[in-house]
């Protein structure tokens, strides 16, 4: 035989691997250390999900994941004596959890939620294709600042979509926004397959429209000043300023990433106010301005949801047609 280094001893498998669900979408696996592990071994546990995703080596005998339980999910766990990823772990033990039973065609589809102005969340969904028209839906939600799962009370319909909204206010000076809201929709009679979603609080945020405070002309420039929606700081927003001129029938849209009120023409030190100068505007014609805002990627993951347009404000004179 060759005189190479002795292979590292493979540890026995972990025992009592079990899985449970907390809240709506927090899946937790726990296990016990292997029986008969080598005494000079400092135990570490290697785990990954069924598709070899999210490998982890840690000393804890538990692992959790926040996941919408719309599909089966499996965790494989093994033990080893070091944190070295190249060390061969014990035989991997697997434990899976399946979504609640039911006809997949009965589950609601397009379940999505929007956090409106960081003050309330509005979720909507379509009925499953294989359900009765008289199905009564219930939406449940949970997030870290709630002690228990809550039921959403304000069910509504918008065309073919069902929806429900619930209060969800941003908590200042906390890691609140780093977390998610867990959502489940099912029917009262238990006939449909429940649907789940996880809404990160840094995405799908729709601000309220801004409020135009002042329009003024200086030479041929139009100075626009507006108040941003409550709950947002200006550096976290992008803006779109639309100017319509009644005489030339022009329609100009300006995409504004920074809207500081630095010019002396602007009213200064007004809290949560933004400003923009529109160049080359004819003062002796009627100009109508409206503004909308959206979150930006400095503060949020998502930058796709524009607010509704602000109320219009006009400045200048409408010329008499002769």
């Amino acid at each position: 035989g060759g005189g190479g280094a002795a292979p590292t001893e493979t540890q026995p498998p972990v025992t009592n691997l079990s899985v449970s669900v907390e809240n709506l979408c927090t899946v937790i696996w726990t296990w016990n250390p292997p029986e008969g592990a080598s005494s000079n071994c400092s135990l570490w546990y290697f785990s990954h999900f069924g598709d070899k995703q999210d490998k982890k080596i840690a000393p804890e005998t538990r692992r959790s994941i926040e996941v919408p339980l719309n599909e089966r999910i499996c965790l494989q766990v093994g033990s080893q004596c070091s944190t070295n990823e190249s060390e061969k772990p014990s035989i991997l033990v697997e434990k899976c959890i399946s979504p609640p039973e039911g006809d997949p065609e009965s589950a609601v589809t397009e379940l999505q939620c929007i956090w409106h102005n960081l003050s309330y969340m509005k979720c909507s969904w379509l009925p499953g294709r294989n359900t009765s028209p008289d199905t009564n839906y219930t939406l449940y939600y949970w997030h870290r600042s709630l002690e228990k799962i809550h039921q959403c009370e304000n069910i509504f319909r918008e065309g073919q979509y069902f929806g429900c909204s619930f209060d969800l206010t941003k908590v200042k000076d906390s890691s609140f926004e780093q977390h998610s809201v867990q959502i489940m929709v099912k029917d009262n009679a238990g006939k449909i397959k429940p649907s789940f979603n996880i809404v990160p609080l840094t995405s799908r945020v729709k601000p309220d429209p801004p409020h135009i405070k002042n329009l003024s002309f200086h030479n041929d420039d139009l100075y626009v000043q507006w108040e941003n929606p409550q709950n947002f700081i200006s550096r976290c927003l992008f803006y779109e300023v639309e100017v319509n001129n009644s005489q030339t029938e022009t329609h100009n849209v300006f995409y504004v990433q920074e809207a500081k009120c630095e010019n002396p023409e602007f009213e200064r030190n007004v809290e949560n106010t933004s400003c923009f100068m529109v160049p080359g505007v004819l003062p002796d014609t009627l100009n109508t301005v409206r503004i909308r805002v959206k979150t930006n990627k400095l503060c949020y993951e998502d930058d796709k949801l524009w607010s509704n347009w602000s109320q219009e404000m006009s400045i200048g004179k409408k010329r008499n047609s002769t």
Partner: antibody, heavy 118, light 107 residues
Framework: EVQVLESGGGLVQPGGSLRLSCAAS????????MTWVRQAPGKGLEWVST????????YYADSVKGRFTISRDNSKNTVYLQMNSLRAEDTAVYYC???????????WGRGTLVTVSS | EIVLTQSPDFQSVTPKEKVTITCRAS??????LHWYQQKPDQSPKLLIK???QSFSGVPSRFSGSGSGTDFTLTINSLEAEDAAAYYC?????????FGQGTKLEIK
């Protein structure tokens, strides 16, 4: 008044392409699925394709899968049916219909005739 | 796929007569059955939704009944303007399916 109006039909050779449009008015377009149903000359109704209000869910009949593509532009209140690799058996009047409630068609357009022939 | 079979395929009737058209589904579809009327050279129109609910603006002589697999469209006291093809349609699951149609002729 709620209405839908199809356009874009015509004569096309086998293997050719055509794009149908359906302009809708009188309702909140993005809240409703839109469907294309066709009717071959002298025959019954055949469902072709459906797209949900926000465009996330799309469904096709087996007979057109891989050849037809449904899409919608909610800013223009319009739904489209792009038809490629057309066959003689696709010859039909194509109706656009608004879906309501639990999947019934409460508003239909007048239809646009597609003829596939060499 | 749900198959819908209508009967009769064709019916010739006189005004004021009562007409019954049946539609049988190949499997239970609850109340997810709708009836459409198509007059010559026109597009279809919704008559009855969910097996028995009249659509707005539809004359009261049209009524629907049934659930599960067997459904009926009834026209009480037929009028000349009711000459048309009538189709049942299932919306339970996909694909949507239509019956082959029943053509109603007025004598």
């Amino acid at each position: 008044e709620v209405q839908v109006l199809e356009s874009g039909g015509g004569l096309v050779q086998p293997g050719g392409s055509l794009r149908l449009s359906c302009a809708a008015s009188g309702f909140t377009f993005s809240n409703y699925a839109m469907t294309w149903v066709r009717q071959a000359p002298g025959k019954g109704l055949e469902w072709v394709s459906t797209i949900s209000g926000r465009g996330y869910s799309i469904y096709y009949a087996d007979s057109v899968k891989g050849r037809f593509t449904i899409s919608r532009d909610n800013s223009k209140n319009t739904v489209y049916l792009q038809m490629n690799s057309l066959r003689a058996e696709d010859t039909a009047v194509y109706y656009c219909a608004k879906e309501e409630g639990h999947w019934y068609f409460d508003v239909w357009g007048r239809g646009t005739l597609v003829t596939v022939s060499s | 796929e749900i198959v819908l079979t209508q009967s009769p395929d064709f019916q010739s009737v006189t005004p004021k007569e009562k007409v019954t058209i049946t539609c049988r589904a190949s499997q239970s579809i609850g109340s997810s059955l709708h009836w459409y009327q198509q007059k010559p050279d026109q597009s279809p129109k919704l008559l009855i939704k969910y097996a028995s609910q009249s659509f707005s603006g539809v004359p009261s002589r049209f009524s629907g009944s049934g659930s599960g697999t067997d459904f009926t469209l009834t026209i009480n006291s037929l009028e000349a303007e009711d000459a048309a093809a009538y189709y049942c349609a299932s919306s339970r699951g996909l694909p949507y399916t239509f019956g082959q149609g029943t053509k109603l002729e007025i004598k």
